[in-house]
Interface confidence: low
């Protein structure tokens, strides 16, 4: 079946079209062309001859046409009247004839479009825009890009006319976008340039920074203000009502307390016509001076004075602070706090509270500290300490005792031997003594600040035979499996050897006992009943030997397990029960009886006359140690049978 | 984030000297206590200089006294020890600590924020 073609269909002016024959039959006399759907000869564009070869225009011809032997219909520089069908007209040999038609479209050139706007400076949340695209085209599309993408859904954009105006209500600082139009027909497609949408907005609540609102006095004070506008803000500032300036930043150098107040900072947007503040409040604080301590007594008396020290100078609504030794106060009940913890008062001060002591002014921003003061306190003299801590001394050597005692003023020392003065010195140095120099050694201290004086008197004894040593003990009853004893040996003499026996022999090896201070002490550790034994000690030098008396040990120890006696459990009734309790014990323990857990007696016998089966039960004898502050018992079960 | 960062240490010959800075940051330098203090290998560490918030009180300990001088520069965030006459036994790691007013602090107590440590070695 004979058919046309139009390659293409759709046609841009100033283009060309093809209107293709398919299927042409064949033996022909030849084919014309006409514009529309039917063989009109006032419509003829080109007729053809095939035995000629002849084409011969019609009326329709418009010069643009040519035709092929094939009967193909080429047009060029199409115009838009060249739109509709095309008949082509054939005539066969045998004459007989036979039609087709095709079309096509002619569409324009679209050119750039651009896009116009109704509001170029749209106010946020007030005013509508409409964007129009630019020319209007008949058979065109319209297409809108944001921000080259697709319109994004939103009940605030609509579409009209065609799709050609983008109205945008009620606009937002968000619209501002990049916004393009694009054409598009069959034939071709175009896009505008961008339009950006200039909102106004704005301005927004200020935002003052720095946000700290409390400053030292002698700061300087710089704020910032910043609002979200379009166009941008123009600023005012003003402090306590009173307009300052017209600048973003308020600065005001070295500050006092009289620049506290209300800062407000204020936002216009020329366009827009609105104003926007946001209020700050500063307040400045006075630098608070360097504190100082003073006292009451420079001086004061270990154990007699009390000192008040005071934070220096007195200023309203501030906080005191105290620390002692760079920590904060401890607690005790020496040290008081006035009501407004001005003053700090040691009561009854000891040579502890030197301190330093360190007093603080504290307001909102800062703490500032005093110097560090040091209390001068006076104390002592102690009791002297006169060392070495021999007493016995061989003639021919030189005597150095030296004196010392805690003080405060340092003490003055005097020397007495027997009661008599003999020099105002720390140390007293005799040369080769002889057994003339024996007596009582005496140190007297001073402390001329506080009038006190301290003696200490110690025995020197001078010769060449070595004295009985006698044993010193630090405890005298010590409890078995509990305590320690230190046996020293005295006098502490130079030059001389210790030595110690137990029950007259050497000293065993045990790990209980140690020899400590040149062997003069003798500790017994964890001490046993065992221990309770009869200890001498020996003192030696090159000339001379001698042994103390011996010392025994009284070790407290039990009560032990008791034990009753007759072992007997049964008995015939009628008997006498004679039952005897005994524990090991140091000393002796108390004894006391229960029958089936009834008290009975506090000795150390039971006795029952002519028993019956009424005493069957068990018998329990109980014993205490109240030195040793441990108890001990036994139960017994006695049977009497009738 | 509040950060102390130490610098200025090194080897040194005994009887030279160096001077150790700290920048604070993150914090309100001015209303801040500063202390320096030191860590020997195999020792606790101990104190060595503070200085009060306003700068106007120092303390050093014993064994620094007149040799080292601590000091500060507000407008700088930064804490400085001058530290002259070096012996062999001041070789240590030395640390920069912030305490929040309060009274000085002679021990690590107190110290709410602490620096990394810059190392120190006096030998010949």
């Known amino acids: 079946k004979l058919t046309i073609e139009s390659t293409p269909f759709n046609v841009a002016e100033g283009k060309e079209v093809l209107l293709l024959v398919h299927n042409l039959p064949q033996h022909l006399f030849g084919y014309s062309w006409y514009k529309g759907e039917r063989v009109d000869g006032n419509r003829q564009i080109i007729g053809y001859v095939i035995g000629t070869q002849q084409a011969t225009p019609g009326p329709a011809y418009s010069g643009r046409e040519i035709i092929y032997p094939n009967a193909s219909l080429l047009i060029q520089n199409i115009i838009q009247n060249d739109t509709g069908f095309y008949t082509l007209h054939v005539i066969k040999s045998d004459l007989v004839n036979e039609e087709a038609t095709g079309q096509f479209r002619v569409y324009p050139e679209l050119p750039k479009p651009s896009i116009s706007s109704n509001n170029s400076k749209p106010v946020e949340d007030k005013d509508a825009v409409a964007f129009t695209c630019e020319p209007e085209t008949q058979d065109a599309t319209y297409l809108w890009w944001v921000n080259n993408q697709s319109l994004p859904v939103s009940p605030r954009l609509q579409l009209s006319n065609g799709n050609r105006t983008l109205t945008l209500f009620n606009v937002t600082r968000n619209d501002t976008a990049s916004y393009k139009c694009e054409t598009q027909n069959p034939v071709s497609a175009r896009r505008s340039d961008s339009v950006i949408l200039n909102v106004l907005y704005g301005p927004d609540a200020p935002t003052i920074s720095p946000l700290n609102t409390s400053y030292r006095s002698g700061e300087n004070l710089n704020l910032s203000c910043h609002a979200a506008s379009n166009p941008p803000a123009q600023y005012s500032w003003f402090v306590n009502g009173t307009f300052q300036q017209s600048t973003q930043e308020l600065f005001i150098p070295n500050i006092t307390v009289n620049n506290s107040g209300s800062y407000t900072c204020q936002a216009h947007n020329s366009d827009t016509g609105l104003n926007r503040t946001t209020v700050t409040t500063i307040t400045v604080y006075a630098e608070p001076p360097k504190p100082f301590i003073t006292s009451n007594n420079s001086n004061p008396v270990e154990d007699e004075d009390a000192v008040a020290l005071t934070c220096e100078p007195e200023i309203q609504n501030t906080t005191y602070l105290w620390w002692v030794n760079n920590q904060s106060l401890p607690v005790s009940p020496r040290l008081q706090l006035s009501n407004d913890n001005r003053t700090l008062t040691l009561l009854s001060v000891t040579r502890n509270d030197v301190g330093p002591y360190e007093c603080g002014i504290q307001n909102e921003l800062s703490v500032d500290h005093s110097d560090p003061v040091i209390l001068n306190v006076l104390y002592g003299p102690d009791d002297p300490t006169i060392s070495p801590s021999y007493t016995y001394y061989r003639p021919g050597v030189n005597l150095s005792l030296s004196c010392h005692a805690a003080s405060n003023p340092p003490a003055q020392y005097s020397w007495l031997i027997d009661g008599n003065i003999q020099q105002h010195t720390q140390e007293l140095f005799i040369s080769n003594i002889t057994e003339k120099n024996s007596g009582l050694y005496t140190c007297q201290a001073n402390n001329s600040a506080s009038g006190h004086s301290r003696t200490t008197v110690k025995t020197i004894t001078v010769s060449a035979e070595l004295p009985k040593p006698s044993i010193s003990s630090n405890n005298s009853k010590p409890v078995e499996d509990k305590d320690a004893v230190a046996f020293t040996c005295e006098p502490e003499a130079q030059n001389t050897t210790y030595l110690w026996w137990v029950n007259g022999q050497s000293l065993p090896v045990s790990p209980r006992l140690q020899l400590s201070n040149g062997n003069r002490t003798l500790t017994l550790f964890n001490v046993t009943r065992n221990d309770a034994r009869a200890y001498v000690c020996g003192i030696q030098n090159s000339v001379s030997a001698n042994r103390s008396d011996p010392v025994t040990l009284d070790v407290l120890y039990g009560p032990d397990t008791p034990i009753i006696s007759p072992p007997d459990s049964s008995y015939l009734s009628g008997a006498n029960l004679n039952l005897s309790c005994h524990s090991a014990s140091n000393p002796s323990p108390q004894y006391s009886w229960r029958i089936n857990g009834i008290p009975q007696q506090h000795t150390q016998v039971l006795f029952i006359a002519k028993i019956t089966p009424n005493n069957n039960g068990t018998y329990a004898c109980f014993v205490s140690n109240l030195a040793t502050g441990r108890n001990n018992s036994i139960v017994k079960s006695i049977t009497v049978s009738a | 984030e509040v950060q102390l960062v130490e610098s200025g240490g090194g080897v040194v010959q005994p009887g030279g000297s160096l001077r150790l800075s700290c920048a604070a940051s993150?914090?309100?330098?001015?209303?801040?206590?500063m202390g320096w203090f030191r860590q020997a290998p195999g020792e606790e560490r101990e104190f060595v200089a503070a200085?009060?918030?306003?700068?106007?009180?120092?303390y050093y300990a014993d064994s620094v006294k007149g040799r080292f001088t601590i000091s500060r520069d507000n407008a700088k965030n930064t804490v400085y020890l001058q530290m002259n006459s070096l012996r062999p036994e001041d070789t240590a790691l030395y640390y920069c600590a912030a305490q929040h007013f309060g009274p000085i602090g002679l021990t690590t107590r107190g110290y709410h924020y602490w620096g990394q440590g810059t190392l120190v070695t006096v030998s010949s």
């Open positions: 200085i009060i918030w306003s700068g106007s009180n120092t």
């Open positions: 993150g914090l309100t330098f001015s209303t801040y206590t």
